[in-house]
């Protein structure tokens, strides 16, 4: 019968040829009376057999990632009679893996959005690298993820590639971060290959800033001839938030005379001071009112940032008009 062990050949051998093993008949007494032959895909081009000894050689550099298995057939013939000594036999040559492929991030570019002020541990995104090497061959395709850039705000789970927040971030200080993740095979051991990817993490706004008046005192004037409904001037607050989180409502906090009103221009986010009742210079030539400003939308969990509304004082001077 045929005698052989399982055949393995390492991929990417840089030698001209590589001895894989021996195929022989147990009837072969070593006197060169038998001839061994190799048949099948790869015979003669990738593998050869020493026809006298049955020794098999790879005569070409192999790439396991291209082809990991060769199925060949062997024959052994008695040179004197030309007859087969053994029935033709099929055998397998397996290409064994070396760590010749670096991890690759296939879903690049990565981009994620996370609310500012998110607590530690908040999941941002998962990055995944793949390695063409054999996952069943040692640690050639076992990956470990690490953070090359992004501390102290982000962390990555070494085995999953899950990126989490590790420190609260304020969009009003910095609104986006570039995080660089490295994937290393061989679970980081010597001889490891690595690949990197960049993740753009954008912070979305939350309403963590209340509007604040630009001025603590505004001076306006109104003619005593002005009809009710007249706009006598504008006041303005600023809000570091953006979008609907910066939408605000102005209102009167103090006006004993009940002469003025404030309406909000939602286009410009300005407060417009309106004359509610006609004024008379001879009766009262100046007024003092207090205005306040609040955000339009404040979720319950963010009320802590909005406890005291910003206020401003408005001094209004009445202008005299000659009366007949």
């Amino acid at each position: 019968g045929w005698v052989w062990n399982q055949f393995f050949v390492p991929e990417e051998m840089n030698t001209t040829s590589h001895h894989i093993g021996q195929l022989r008949s147990d009837l072969d007494n070593g006197n060169n009376s038998f001839q061994y032959k190799l048949l099948g895909a790869g015979a003669g081009s990738t593998f050869i057999i020493d026809e006298r000894t049955g020794d098999i050689y790879a005569i070409q550099k192999l790439d396991r990632e291209e082809r990991s298995l060769y199925i060949l057939r062997a024959q052994v013939i008695d040179i004197a009679t030309g007859r087969a000594v053994e029935p033709e036999s099929e055998f397998v040559i397996k290409v064994s893996d070396i760590n010749d492929n670096e991890p690759k991030f296939l879903d690049e570019p990565y981009e994620a959005i996370v609310p500012e002020m998110s607590p530690e541990g908040t999941l941002v995104i998962q990055v995944t690298a793949s390695d063409a090497d054999d996952p069943s061959s040692g640690n050639n395709a076992r990956l470990l993820y690490s953070l090359l850039q992004g501390q102290p705000y982000f962390s990555v789970e070494p085995t999953t590639g899950v990126i989490r927040i590790s420190s609260k971030m304020d969009r009003e200080l910095q609104d986006e971060y570039w995080v660089i993740i490295q994937a290393k095979d061989m679970i980081g051991q010597p001889g490891a290959l690595s690949g990197t990817t960049s993740v753009l993490i954008k912070l979305s706004d939350v309403n963590d800033n209340k509007p604040i008046f630009k001025e603590s005192l505004y001076r306006l004037t109104v003619s005593e001839s002005a009809p009710t409904g007249t706009s006598i001037g504008t006041i303005m607050a600023y809000d570091n938030d953006i979008g609907e989180n910066a939408e605000m409502d102005y209102s009167i906090e103090e006006d004993d005379s009940q002469t003025f009103d404030i309406i909000t221009n939602h286009e410009t986010q300005e407060g417009i001071v309106i004359l509610k009742k006609k004024v008379d210079f001879e009766h009262q030539n100046h007024y003092g009112i207090r205005a306040k400003v609040k955000n339009h939308h404040v979720p319950e969990q963010l009320m802590k940032y909005h406890t005291e509304a910003s206020t401003t004082f408005i001094k209004i001077q009445v202008e005299d008009v000659d009366e007949p």
Epitope: T15, T16, G44, T46, I48, Y57
Partner: antibody
Framework: EVQLLESGGGLVQPGGSLRLSCAAS????????MNWVRQAPGKGLEWVST????????YYADSVKGRFTISSDNSKSTLYLQMNSLRAEDTAVYHC??????????????WGQGTTVTVSS | EIVMTQSPVTLSLSLGERATLSCRAS??????LAWFQQKPGQAPRLLIY???TRATGIPARFSGSGSGTEFTLTISSLEPEDFAVYYC?????????FGGGTKVEIK
């Protein structure tokens, strides 16, 4: 008896081309690797190129890569070397040599007498 | 590439003497080394392959030894037809490379 007979050498100007042939007999040509080795006048041996049996794999010395092409015709049991963009330093006797068996597959166990290539203006 | 260095360049010996030729590889080539003999105007002839296996028809006075980076060709007793140039060659890595040769001449 294994025999190798080279032909096709001659005098050629720099930049010119030549095609060398090596007719083989006495063995199963397609089962063996074949080589070209050259020897400049008064110098040592220099490997040029190798082709595996059946022609699947070819290898070249850096000095000839991109200029020379090795090929074989199993039906004629003939090895070829197409030489283009020839230079003065390619002047040599060109030998073909048969590969061996097993672990000596990419070796050189039988040599031809050689054919002379002279590159000169 | 693997650099093969032969020494000495010339070896002057008398008939019947023992010749020892050395060949060193710049890195390990296992046992994938061959020795060739070349006489003026002739093609090289294979003497030894696999560092120590004599080719068909080669007399027993020729022997090879060594592995890795250091190799030796020994001619136990020089005959008149042995005076020639001897080359070592590695076939473990591409490109295949030859040593510069050792000329064995009559003293």
């Amino acid at each position: 008896e294994v025999q190798l007979l080279e032909s096709g050498g001659g005098l050629v100007q720099p930049g010119g081309s030549l095609r060398l042939s090596c007719a083989a007999s006495g063995f199963t040509f397609s089962s063996y690797a074949m080589n070209w080795v050259r020897q400049a006048p008064g110098k040592g041996l220099e490997w040029v190129s190798t082709i595996s049996g059946g022609g699947a794999n070819t290898y070249y010395a850096d000095s000839v890569k991109g200029r020379f092409t090795i090929s074989s015709d199993n039906s004629k049991s003939t090895l070829y070397l197409q030489m283009n963009s020839l230079r003065a330093e390619d002047t040599a006797v060109y030998h073909c040599a048969k590969g061996g068996m097993g672990g000596y597959y990419y070796g050189m166990d039988v040599w031809g007498q050689g054919t002379t290539v002279t590159v000169s203006s | 590439e693997i650099v093969m260095t032969q020494s000495p360049v010339t070896l002057s010996l008398s008939l019947g003497e023992r010749a020892t030729l050395s060949c060193r590889a710049s890195q390990s080539i296992s046992s994938n080394l061959a020795w060739f003999q070349q006489k003026p105007g002739q093609a090289p002839r294979l003497l030894i392959y696999g560092a120590f296996t004599r080719a068909t028809g080669i007399p027993a006075r020729f022997s090879g030894s060594g592995s890795g980076t250091e190799f030796t060709l020994t001619i136990s007793s020089l005959e008149p037809e042995d005076f020639a140039v001897y080359y070592c060659q590695q076939y473990n890595y591409w490109p295949l490379t030859f040593g510069g040769g050792t000329k064995v001449e009559i003293k």
